[in-house]
């Protein structure tokens, strides 16, 4: 995870002035996945390459956020661009962040994990237990390494949360899961909440 | 009850390359990991690789980056194991291994010895 | 990577003993430690995992303890069937790794 946007990023630096106006224009027509939401229009518009990069990982997340770029610049004519955005798809295509699953737009839903970012981030203590129930499955090696660098729990909890706008639904899942096991009480005392 | 039944012996050539397989049942195949090991004869064991089989991801030691590629077929629970450009030196037996939680090993399968001689 | 030692490659035990066998991490390995036995005929069980957790369907005559980098698997009423050889791995880093093993045998 990471590298996505990354690629997303670099093609869209990429792009002259015009081809960017004309790849926004572009993305608010495009046909979108079910469960999907577009970005609108006023705020779109007004974005520089980084800006657009961040909002189409937040709304539609690395894996489908790339496959909509690729899309979009295939009917822009950009063939080379899409390519290698392409390859990216192909080579990072592992991690459970890069399964298809439809984000159910967590903005609107709001998942346990957004709602209460910051009082898991004050409360859990018992990080590593969180980490071994993510690896592999949801966080990568490298991702696991970092998180467990972190000196303090807060550190570590907000290092594991700077990966989660890359995550889909059933990643988000999986923290809450791993937290029910680990923080039962923690849990239930934010449910209430 | 889980159980990891790993395919019979390999009489290869040097240069060759093997797949050998892992065929995993009792559990969900997908929820867990399954790692490979390696251990020439009278000697300690050598951890190769592992795959996460609900996602593909899989993480090699750099030892064996390019001798061993780890799939996974989850229509039949089967893990695979292939080595490439064979030597002596990959004579050995393999074991495949389930991953638990703290990635121990919990469940280990009986092993396939690959012998490679011309 | 880090290196797992076990000091002591073979150990002979009379029948009732307590056995200690040891494992030494090259740095800390905060608990991620593991215990294999390997029988004679090859199969491998997982004993202790993460330090002292023991493994379900285990005899409670094998325990283990240690933290940083020392750790330690003991039988504390060593039995014929325990004739093996033990084996200890790290999973806390990449390459993950196992000890040269430790040969039990009865005196």
């Known amino acids: 995870m990471g590298r996505a946007r990354d690629a997303i990023l670099d093609a869209l630096e990429n792009l002259s002035g015009d081809e960017l106006k004309k790849f926004k224009m572009k993305l608010l027509t495009v046909q979108l996945r079910e469960g999907y939401g577009r970005i609108p229009r006023g705020a779109l518009l007004q974005m520089d390459a980084i800006d657009l990069t961040d909002k189409l990982v937040s709304y539609y997340l690395e894996s489908y956020g790339l496959e909509l770029t690729m899309t979009v610049l295939r009917d822009m004519g950009l063939q080379e661009l899409a390519e290698q955005l392409q390859t990216t798809k192909e080579e990072s295509g592992a991690v459970a962040a890069a399964a298809s699953v439809p984000a159910q737009s967590t903005a609107r839903t709001g998942h346990f994990v957004d709602q209460h970012r910051q009082a898991l981030i004050a409360r859990v203590t018992e990080v590593d237990g969180v980490l071994d129930a993510l690896h592999g499955s949801v966080l990568t090696e490298g991702q696991y390494q970092a998180v467990r660098a972190e000196t303090t729990s807060q550190d570590k909890m907000r290092k594991l949360f700077s990966f989660v706008p890359s995550w889909n639904l059933t990643c988000k899942d999986s923290l809450l899961q791993a937290l029910k096991e680990i923080h039962p009480y923690l849990v239930m005392d934010l449910e209430q909440s | 009850e889980v159980q990891l039944q790993q395919s019979g012996a390999e009489l290869v050539r040097p240069g060759s390359s093997v797949k050998m397989s892992c065929e995993t049942s009792?559990?969900?195949?997908?929820?867990?990991?399954l790692t490979w090991v390696k251990q020439r004869p009278g000697q300690g064991l050598e951890w190769i690789g592992y795959?996460?089989?609900?996602?593909?991801?899989?993480e090699y030691n750099e030892k064996f980056k390019d001798k061993a590629t780890l799939t996974s077929d989850t229509s039949s629970s089967i893990v695979y194991m292939q080595l490439s450009s064979l030597t002596s030196e990959d004579s050995a037996i393999y074991f495949c291994a389930r991953l638990g939680l703290r990635r121990h090993f919990d469940y280990w399968g009986q092993g396939t010895t690959l012998t490679v001689s011309s | 990577a880090i290196q797992m030692t076990q000091t002591t490659s073979s150990l002979s035990a009379s029948l009732g003993d307590r056995v200690t066998i040891s494992c030494r991490a090259s740095q800390d390995i905060s608990n991620y430690l593991h215990w294999y036995q390997q029988k004679p005929d090859g199969t491998v069980k997982l004993l202790i995992f993460?330090?002292?957790g023991l493994r379900s369907g285990v005899p409670s005559r094998f325990s283990g303890s240690g933290s940083g980098t020392d750790y330690s698997l003991t039988i504390s009423n060593l039995e014929q069937e325990d004739i093996a050889t033990y084996f200890c791995?790290?999973?806390?880093?990449?390459?993950?790794?196992f000890g040269g093993g430790t040969k039990l045998e009865i005196k």
């Open positions: 993460f330090t002292s």
């Open positions: 791995q790290q999973s806390i880093l990449l390459p993950w790794t």
């Open positions: 009792g559990y969900t195949f997908t929820t867990y990991g």
């Open positions: 795959i996460y089989v609900g996602n593909g991801y899989t």
